[in-house]
């Protein structure tokens, strides 16, 4: 969590921003929220990125000014106009980038001051775990499958009977380019499991980590799978 | 309450063949995969064949591939095993079971019929 003040004459403004992480491909925000003025038309936010020349997004007056927007972010932002009044400048990225990725400033002017605080916004791609019994092989196995990921991330297998066991002898992980030649296609095996146990396929970069479990009995497959991004902090 | 009741076993010829059915009663059929097993009188069971639920995947054991043919009927709740080209060493009693994946360790099954024996022989 980031929180910055206004430096001059006028008084400053609290501004808060959150680094957050964007998915390529998908659509993104980028968090900042401020102290709400009473009229619309006094409320100026800007977005900026550094090392970018024009403004990332324009909103003044009630409505986006994008005149001076740098030619990359073109067509791919939105704030939420509705929102703008009770302090929420948030600024929706369209089908994020890799190169999206640095330091944004969120810069805010009302009546009763101004205001900025600073964002890191990372890149890459993340997507959630499914684990499957894997009919196709000889033993008892299961294969934990993630559509998309960028950069390479590890993989671990861990187990609710075994805690603490070292599953990499008795596993195997493949990573496939996608068509578009950026993010990877996970693939984990882990051979040898054993039905009642609980097992977890742990998927991690540096954006995101994900969890699919999955345990077998013998009247039923249960599974589960949750995603967290990491380094999720307010400024 | 699970409940599996094979019958059509017999005593065939050599070369000979014969349908065994299996009616699966007290649980949602569809939900599982159905596994026949056998057992030869004073020796251990061995897996003999699975089918999954919706039928679109089948294997078996390696002595009796070509041989026996898997099948189910979901509308009626029953799983088949066509056995051909009979043998001798095919004399068992013969069980179906459930079991929630392919999976076919024997340990892992819960739910037994009484069976029905087969005897081949001339």
């Known amino acids: 969590l980031i929180i910055g003040f206004g430096i001059s004459g006028r008084h400053s403004i609290t501004v808060t921003t959150v680094a957050s992480a964007g998915n390529i491909g998908e659509d993104g925000i980028l968090s900042c929220t401020f102290e709400p003025d009473i009229k619309l038309s006094d409320i100026v936010i800007q977005w900026l990125k550094e090392g970018v020349l024009g403004l990332v997004h324009e909103f003044k007056e009630g409505k986006d000014e994008l005149s001076e927007q740098d030619e990359m972010f073109r067509g791919r932002t939105a704030v939420f106009a509705d929102q703008v009044i009770v302090g929420n400048a948030s600024l929706r990225l369209k089908n994020v980038q890799l190169t999206d990725a640095g330091t944004y400033k969120c810069y805010i002017i009302t009546s009763k001051g101004k205001g900025n605080a600073n964002l890191e916004y990372k890149t890459g791609a993340f997507s959630m775990p499914e684990v499957n019994v894997d009919y196709n092989a000889s033993s008892e196995t299961l294969r934990c499958e993630a559509p998309r990921w960028f950069p390479q991330p590890t993989v671990v297998w861990a187990s609710q009977v075994d805690q603490g066991a070292n599953f990499s002898e008795v596993s195997n992980t493949s990573f496939e380019l996608n068509s578009e030649n950026v993010t990877m296609k996970v693939v984990s095996v882990l051979y040898n499991v054993t039905i009642n146990n609980t097992y977890s396929c742990m998927i991690e970069n540096d954006i995101a980590k994900a969890t699919g479990d999955i345990k077998v009995t013998e009247s039923e497959i249960k599974r589960r799978s949750h995603l967290q991004l990491l380094n999720s902090k307010a400024s | 309450e699970v409940q599996l009741v094979e019958s059509g076993g017999g005593l065939v010829q050599p070369g000979g063949s014969l349908r065994l059915s299996c009616a699966a009663s007290?649980?949602?059929?569809?939900?599982?995969?159905m596994h026949w097993v056998r057992q030869v009188p004073g020796k251990g069971r061995e897996w003999v064949s699975r089918?999954?639920?919706?039928?679109?995947?089948?294997s078996y054991e390696d002595s009796v591939k070509g041989r026996f043919t898997i099948s189910r009927d979901n509308a009626k709740n029953t799983v088949y095993l066509q056995m051909h080209g009979l043998r001798a060493e095919d004399t068992a009693v013969y069980y179906c079971?459930?079991?929630?994946?392919?999976?076919?360790?024997?340990?892992?099954?819960?739910?037994w019929g009484q069976g029905t024996l087969v005897t081949v022989s001339s």
């Open positions: 079971t459930r079991f929630s994946t392919g999976w076919h360790r024997i340990e892992y099954f819960q739910h």
């Open positions: 007290g649980f949602t059929f569809t939900d599982f995969w």
């Open positions: 089918i999954s639920p919706d039928s679109s995947s089948t």
